[in-house]
Interface confidence: medium
């Protein structure tokens, strides 16, 4: 209790002023529960077995709810997409109680974080999308999606990261909010696919006989599985698959006094086959 002193001045019958001081004990007025819990926040927790939500009231004290609907500041057994009304009171505040409308989100298992990356571009891009796989009655207007990948934040249902490094791991965290309340989240660590191998470096490429030629090279730096060597004479083209450990190949049974154009590229079989850039060279066979 605080002591509150108030002074009153009155005139006596003789006309002289009499000043009397009254000291009264007062209690500070309590706020209303409506005011006290005006900005109360709620977290929704989902039970996958019962397919029901629990709303956790973010308050510092153990509040009471009308009709005993809450225990330990939690409101249990809430059905998805149904509004529930909770009357919140506490001995630290007076009537009227705070009437809290719980806007229950859709069921968590109705959303799936899906990797939508196109295999052809999986070496340098990542696509992630929240997919809705079951029907619900919540208003989709109230659903928002958020992604955080490194220091990049996106407010979209679907994201595409481009110009990434091949064979690198990237982590994306995502959450879904219903009426600005987070109700589910997921993280994905995605490793980008093998990139296209680099270009082999041709060391020499020549013919020293009428029916033979030789090509030698250094392999590319990046990962690869095999080489493809193609040689073109006039309009004919022949291609060979060469083992990744080869650095030299002898061409036999060539046509005399003919120009051969050679192309050599490495490739890797990843999510798709990726071909590296081709190194080119040419020679002309000797006359017979």
């Amino acid at each position: 209790a605080y002591l509150n002193a108030s002074e009153t001045t009155t005139l006596s019958p003789s006309g002289s002023a009499v000043i009397s001081t009254t000291t009264i004990a007062t209690t500070p007025s309590k706020p209303t529960c409506d005011e006290k819990y005006a900005n109360i926040t709620v977290d929704y927790l989902y039970n996958k077995e019962t397919k029901l939500f629990t709303a956790k009231l973010n308050v510092n004290e153990n509040v009471e709810c009308g009709n005993n609907t809450c225990t330990n500041n939690e409101v249990h057994n809430l059905t998805e997409c149904k509004n529930a009304s909770v009357s919140i009171s506490h001995n630290s505040c007076t009537a009227p109680d705070k009437t809290l409308i719980l806007d229950v989100p859709p069921g968590v298992e109705k959303f799936q974080l899906h990797d939508c990356t196109q295999v052809e571009k999986a070496d340098t891009t990542i696509c992630l999308k929240w997919k809705n796989i079951e029907t619900f009655t919540c208003d989709t207007q109230n659903i928002t999606y958020r992604f955080q990948c490194g220091n990049m934040i996106f407010d979209n249902k679907e994201i595409k990261l481009e110009n990434l490094e091949p064979e690198h791991e990237y982590k994306c965290d995502s959450e879904i909010l219903y009426n600005n309340h987070k109700f589910t989240n997921a993280s994905k660590i995605i490793k980008t696919d093998f990139g296209s191998p680099g270009e082999p470096q041709i060391i020499f490429c020549r013919s020293e006989a009428a029916h033979q030629g030789v090509i030698t090279w250094n392999p590319p730096q990046r990962s690869f599985h095999n080489f493809t060597l193609c040689y073109i004479k006039e309009t004919e083209k022949d291609c060979l698959n060469l083992d990744k450990n080869l650095i030299k190949y002898d061409l036999q049974n060539l046509k005399p006094y003919t120009k051969y154009v050679l192309s050599l590229h490495a490739y890797i079989i990843a999510k798709v086959q990726r071909n590296g850039s081709a190194a080119m060279c040419h020679f002309t066979t000797k006359s017979a």
Partner: antibody, heavy 119, light 113 residues
């Protein structure tokens, strides 16, 4: 209320181009995958293109692949269909429709816009 | 591509009588997640199509319960328990399981006898 309104249809010569638009209102457009579906006069429905909610993925049937391009502008709540190298068999009413996800259903359709390809 | 074949193509029905439309897919339309994305759409004369049934048997909101869907694998059926005058139009089945190759059936025209 939830609405889709197509525009941009009209008469075009074979080999010509046309761009259709679909204005969306009354819902969170950026959460929805969208499609264009057409109906030739007196014929059935034919799906012609799909775009995912963020515009990342696009799909087309072989009948229009390479000639039609679907795109969207989520900031403007708009869907587009660019049609090039038009043929007489592309004559149809073109509907835009929303699909909450790729595994969902077309729950809202526009009224359609008529495209006539004729010389 | 998945081909959806409807029968009959024309269906004359007496008011108050039941009607049934069949839809057959050229291959199974059960998705790898075990769900079947088979839908039915109604198109009344001069109107845009309207969703009736999704995922084989689920009635879309606002659709009268005289409509029902059934089937599995490759064979599906739309039934109307008692046909009313407002049911006149063309009915299309549609598969959304084999994405991205969406396909509609060729349509069944329901008319009053």
């Amino acid at each position: 209320q939830v609405q889709l309104v197509e525009s941009g249809g009209g008469l075009v010569k074979p080999g010509g181009s046309l761009r259709l638009s679909c204005a969306a209102s009354g819902f969170a457009f950026s959460n929805y995958d969208m499609s264009w579906i057409r109906q030739a006069p007196g014929k059935g429905l034919e799906w012609v293109s799909y775009i995912s909610s963020g515009g990342v993925s696009t799909y087309y049937p072989d009948t229009v692949k390479g000639r039609f391009t679907i795109s969207r502008d989520n900031a403007k709540n708009s869907l587009y269909l660019q049609m090039n190298s038009l043929r007489a068999e592309d004559t149809a009413v073109y509907y835009c429709a929303r699909r909450y996800d790729v595994w969902w259903y077309f729950d809202v359709w526009g009224r359609g816009t008529l495209v006539t390809v004729s010389s | 591509d998945v081909v959806m074949t409807q029968s009959p193509l024309s269906l004359p029905v007496t008011l108050g009588q039941p009607a049934s439309i069949s839809c057959r897919s050229s291959q199974s339309i059960v998705h790898s997640n075990a769900k079947t994305y088979l839908e039915w759409y109604q198109q009344r004369p001069g109107q845009s199509p309207r969703l009736l049934i999704y995922k084989v048997s689920n009635l879309f909101s606002g659709v009268p319960d005289r409509f029902s869907g059934s089937g599995s694998g490759t064979d599906f059926t739309l039934k109307i328990s008692r046909v009313e005058a407002e049911d006149v139009g063309v009915y299309y089945c549609f598969q959304g399981s084999h994405v991205p190759m969406y396909t509609f059936g060729q349509g069944t025209k329901l008319e009053i006898k």
